[in-house]
């Protein structure tokens, strides 16, 4: 398998489906934030 550098600018939900994602690439973080990020679970709710 090859390595690659993930695009850092924008991401689209893999599982949402075309009619729901509407081909848009939301400017949000990848789906997993490192645990080194915010300590409080509530602070993750900003990622909408």
């Amino acid at each position: 398998m090859e390595d690659f550098n993930m695009e850092s600018d924008s991401f689209e939900d893999f599982w949402k489906g075309e009619d729901l994602s509407n081909y848009s690439y939301s400017s949000t973080l990848p789906p997993f934030l490192l645990d080194a990020a915010p300590c409080e679970p509530e602070s993750l709710e900003i990622n909408k």
Epitope: F4, M6, E7, D9, S10, F11, E12, D13, F14, W15, K16, G17, E18, D19, Y23, Y25, T28, L29, P30, P31, F32, L33, L34, D35, A37, P41, L44, E45, N47, K48
Partner: antibody
Framework: QVQLVQSGAEVKKPGSSVKVSCKAS????????ISWVRQAPGQGPEWMGW????????NYAQKFQGRVTMTRDTSISTAYMELSRLRPDDTAVYYC?????????????WGQGTLVTVSS | QAVLTQPSSLSASPGASVSLTCTLR?????????IYWYQQKPGSPPQFLLR?????????GSGVPSRFSGSRDASANAGILLISGLRSEDEADYYC?????????FGGGTQLTVLG
């Protein structure tokens, strides 16, 4: 590297329920959907539905409406899938999966699978 | 009739190029869908390979070699997974999937055997 780690194998009686967990190890569940996909022995994958871990919103496949419940606990980075009124033909490996796509690449995460056996 | 139909098995020699087809049911136009392709080996979950709708709308799975590529055959109303330079480790089951009528639908899969 984030991994999705699922709970262990289960043996259930017909008519009972099973609850499978899916924990993000090395990371935290975020806003992208967690799908649940099952695979009966010798069969292809079958999508059951997804949950948005951020909002808790769900989208269930019509076949499983009324029998499946997907939930999450963000405080422990874990998603759950509960299937009720089990039948022998629910015997399958159950997977959780998530992922995201950039403009040229997609990254997809899958759990290792949980074997659920339904037998009297 | 199934939404997605795949040949049940296919065999080829190492180094060859193989095309795996995923035919959409009549009335469902392949040009309107992203076709997702997965590889699965015994005892492991499916691994996403790529998705393909057109040459301007295609994404490779992370870490998936470029010898796996997608295309479509409009005349056959089918998505195609092309594997070039076939290797023994490519022996696996291959599934296609689409998002159709607000649900993910998977094909029945093709068992690819690498001869020799």
């Amino acid at each position: 590297q984030v991994q999705l780690v699922q709970s262990g194998a289960e043996v259930k009686k017909p008519g009972s329920s099973v609850k499978v967990s899916c924990k993000a190890s090395g990371g935290t569940l975020s806003s992208y959907a967690i799908s649940w996909v099952r695979q009966a022995p010798g069969q292809g994958p079958e999508w059951m539905g997804w949950i948005n871990p951020n909002s808790g919103g769900t989208n269930y496949a019509q076949k499983f409406q009324g029998r499946v419940t997907m939930t999450r606990d963000t405080s422990i980075s874990t998603a759950y899938m509960e299937l009720s009124r089990l039948r022998p033909d629910d015997t399958a490996v159950y997977y959780c999966a998530s992922g995201y796509c950039g403009r040229a690449r997609c990254t997809s995460f899958w759990g290792q699978g949980t074997l659920v056996t339904v037998s009297s | 009739q199934a939404v997605l139909t795949q040949p049940s098995s296919l065999s080829a020699s190492p180094g060859a190029s193989v095309s795996l087809t995923c035919t959409l049911r009549s009335g469902i136009n392949v040009g309107a869908y992203r076709i997702y392709w997965y590889q699965q080996k015994p005892g492991s979950p499916p691994q996403f390979l790529l998705r393909y709708k057109s040459d301007s709308d295609k994404q490779q799975g992370s870490g998936v070699p470029s010898r796996f590529s997608g295309s479509r055959d409009a005349s056959a109303n089918a998505g195609i997974l092309l594997i070039s330079g076939l290797r023994s480790e490519d022996e696996a089951d291959y599934y296609c999937a689409i998002w159709h009528s607000s649900a993910w639908v998977f094909g029945g899969g093709t068992q690819l055997t690498v001869l020799g």
